[in-house]
Amino acid sequence: MGRARDAILDALENLTAEELKKFKLKLLSVPLREGYGRIPRGALLSMDALDLTDKLVSFYLETYGAELTANVLRDMGLQEMAAALQAATHQ
């Protein structure tokens, strides 16, 4: 497993159930880089942190997946968690 994947999983596992639900909803509308598709809503809403990490990495690869995860965390007001995720990714 890659460092970025571990960092994404760590961040998502640190969210409360309510925050994880909000994360998924924001992920459905977060601005994406050109050329990237959106994870289908139906698949997304039932996922736990582990499944969601796998889906983020498979859709966006590790580097962009970590950046996107950090941005959604920022959109949720979780800037410190976002900074920790990016620091872990760039170690």
Partner: antibody, heavy 114, light 107 residues
Framework: QVQLQQPGTELVKPGASVKLSCRAS?????????????LEWIGNINLSNGRTNYN??FRAMATLTVDKSSSTAYTQLSSLTSEDSAVYYC?????????????WGQGTSVTVSS | NIVMTQYPKSMSLSIGERVTLRCKAS??????VSWYQQKPEQSPKLLIY???NRYTGVPDRFTGSGSATDFILTITSVQAEDLADYHC?????????FGAGTKLELK
Amino acid sequence: QVQLQQPGTELVKPGASVKLSCRASGWTHWVKQRPGQGLEWIGNINLSNGRTNYNEKFRAMATLTVDKSSSTAYTQLSSLTSEDSAVYYCANSMVPHFFPMDYWGQGTSVTVSS
Amino acid sequence: NIVMTQYPKSMSLSIGERVTLRCKASENVGSYVSWYQQKPEQSPKLLIYGASNRYTGVPDRFTGSGSATDFILTITSVQAEDLADYHCGQSYNYPLTFGAGTKLELK
């Protein structure tokens, strides 16, 4: 349009404390503005779970709390000096992305004077 | 802490002029920059968020651009009601920080 309700003015003595209130929702920020100066972020609180973040500059003097039952955010400012005379705004972040402050209260003017 | 530097500090202009306000972040803040308008004795109002997204109800003469460290607010044809202070702010990292503001005044 969401209206954030804040009381208008507070007059307090040096060394005393004041508790400011704001009827709000979601993430509520507190921002200080001295006369003729820029904006300074004090901190924020999430009304749904009580999660807080502070600007270290204000951590010793500001305490952010929430009363969920009335959807009211509070900031208690303690050991006040003349430097703390300012308008204190509350603001919400309701836009889904980029976490801007999209709704602002009208501000509470705090005057510290003996 | 991320420092937001705004310039110029003030601008004197005529109605109908094109205005460019600048904001520079001390480190990369992606697109996490907002612009606020504040008129005397009023609370700030959100104009632009995410560097370039116009907030609901904001006239299209206001345009935001930039990313990373350099950001611009452009007013294509300034109106009398636009004379105010303009603040940029970043929401990329805590503590959230603002620039010192730019004051738009009439010539």
